[in-house]
């Protein structure tokens, strides 16, 4: 039997490799049984997760799941890092796994690393 608690379906250790200057939507898949919870995004800074108050967010509704979306318009180099979504309802807080954005700054990178390089040597993206 499926749990009727709020579920946030971000996979453990998920990551996205993206280009600075491009638009990007970071999705938090949310499943709930009754009323929609209050969902927020935060960015990890060491052990604390700093709430992203003034960033553009939206909902995309589908029949059995909703997506709470954090918009990057455009992606900036300092968007690099790990993000987490949280759902709050009736005093319960549910936190997702973190998802990491690896941002390539096309201005400073003389040549783009290949996808294989990015997967095996993510430090390339911090040059």
């Amino acid at each position: 039997k499926e749990s009727c608690d709020v579920q946030l379906y971000i996979k453990r250790q998920s990551e996205h490799s993206i280009l600075a200057g491009d638009p990007f939507e970071l999705e938090c898949p949310v499943k709930y049984c009754a009323n929609r919870p209050h969902v927020t995004w935060c960015k990890l800074n060491g052990t604390t997760c700093v709430k992203l108050e003034d960033r553009q967010t939206s909902w995309k509704e589908e029949k059995n799941i909703s997506f709470f979306i954090l918009h990057f318009e455009p992606v900036l180099p300092n968007d690099n890092g790990s993000y987490r979504c949280s759902a709050n309802f009736q005093s319960n807080l549910i936190e997702s796994h973190s998802t990491t954005l690896y941002v390539t700054d096309v201005k400073s990178a003389s040549e783009r690393p290949s996808k294989d390089e990015m997967a095996s040597r993510p430090w390339l993206l911090y040059r």
Epitope: K31, R36, H38, W59, K60, E61, K63, N64, F89
Partner: antibody, heavy 121, light 108 residues
């Protein structure tokens, strides 16, 4: 009887503020998405804001930073605080109830009669 | 933002005729679409929710269909009280929640 009654409309100068109220009866507003929708004379419907059961609030770009939606559960009332008003905010303002639970959508099924806001010098 | 385009802007028909109103979304809204009727000096009234479900108390002559980007409101046989303005509204990608510009249904 399920009912919504708006109040607080009136004439205000550009740059001024106004607070609209919506008193609900026959149901509990904190169990629903509660909206403000406006309509300028002879024009279509324009969504203004929503507050969800969890207290989350959302606005379109046209009013974000100027309007604030809130509710008082003890009074079963919904509010819209409108600041920095412009001539373009002149409209009839309706509050409406919407059911949206478990990823199903039920539409805005209960509406108030509306309250008129006129922004003019 | 999702733009809803309703057509025609005005529809002139006689009582007893069939009315077909269209609402087209700029991108898919799944079935998260509602239809409202509004008469002069009155608040809107919910007719159809979730694209095809009749709201409580709405006569069977009103029906909704469609999913994705193309939706239709059909009134099978017009009654005198059906002449009004009709709006579609989406709640699929939001904010903002958006309404169509309306279709005016008038007596021919």
């Amino acid at each position: 009887e399920v009912q919504l009654v708006e109040s607080g409309g009136g004439l205000v100068q550009p740059g001024g503020s106004l607070r609209l109220s919506c008193a609900a009866s026959g149901f509990t507003i904190s169990s629903y998405d509660m909206h403000w929708v406006r309509q300028a004379t002879g024009k279509g419907l324009e969504w203004v804001s929503v507050i969800g059961p969890a207290g989350d609030t959302y606005y379109p770009g046209s009013v974000k930073g100027r309007f604030t939606i809130s509710r008082e559960n003890a009074k079963n009332s919904l509010y819209l605080q409108m600041n920095s008003l412009r001539a373009g905010d002149t409209a009839v303002y309706y509050c409406a109830r919407e059911g949206m639970a478990a990823h199903n959508y039920y539409g805005m099924d209960v509406w108030g009669q509306g309250t008129t806001v006129t922004v003019s010098s | 933002e999702i733009v809803l385009t309703q057509s025609p802007a005005t529809l002139s028909l006689s009582p007893g005729e069939r009315a077909t109103l269209s609402c087209r979304a700029s991108q898919s809204v799944s079935s998260y679409l509602a239809w409202y009727q509004q008469k002069p000096g009155q608040a809107p009234r919910l007719l159809i929710y979730d694209a095809s479900n009749r709201a409580t108390g709405i006569p069977a002559r009103f029906s909704g269909s469609g999913s994705g980007t193309d939706f239709t409101l059909t009134i099978s046989s017009l009654e005198p009280e059906d002449f009004a303005v009709y709006y579609c509204q989406q709640r699929s990608n939001w904010p903002p929640i958006t309404f169509g510009q309306g279709t005016r249904l008038e007596i021919k």
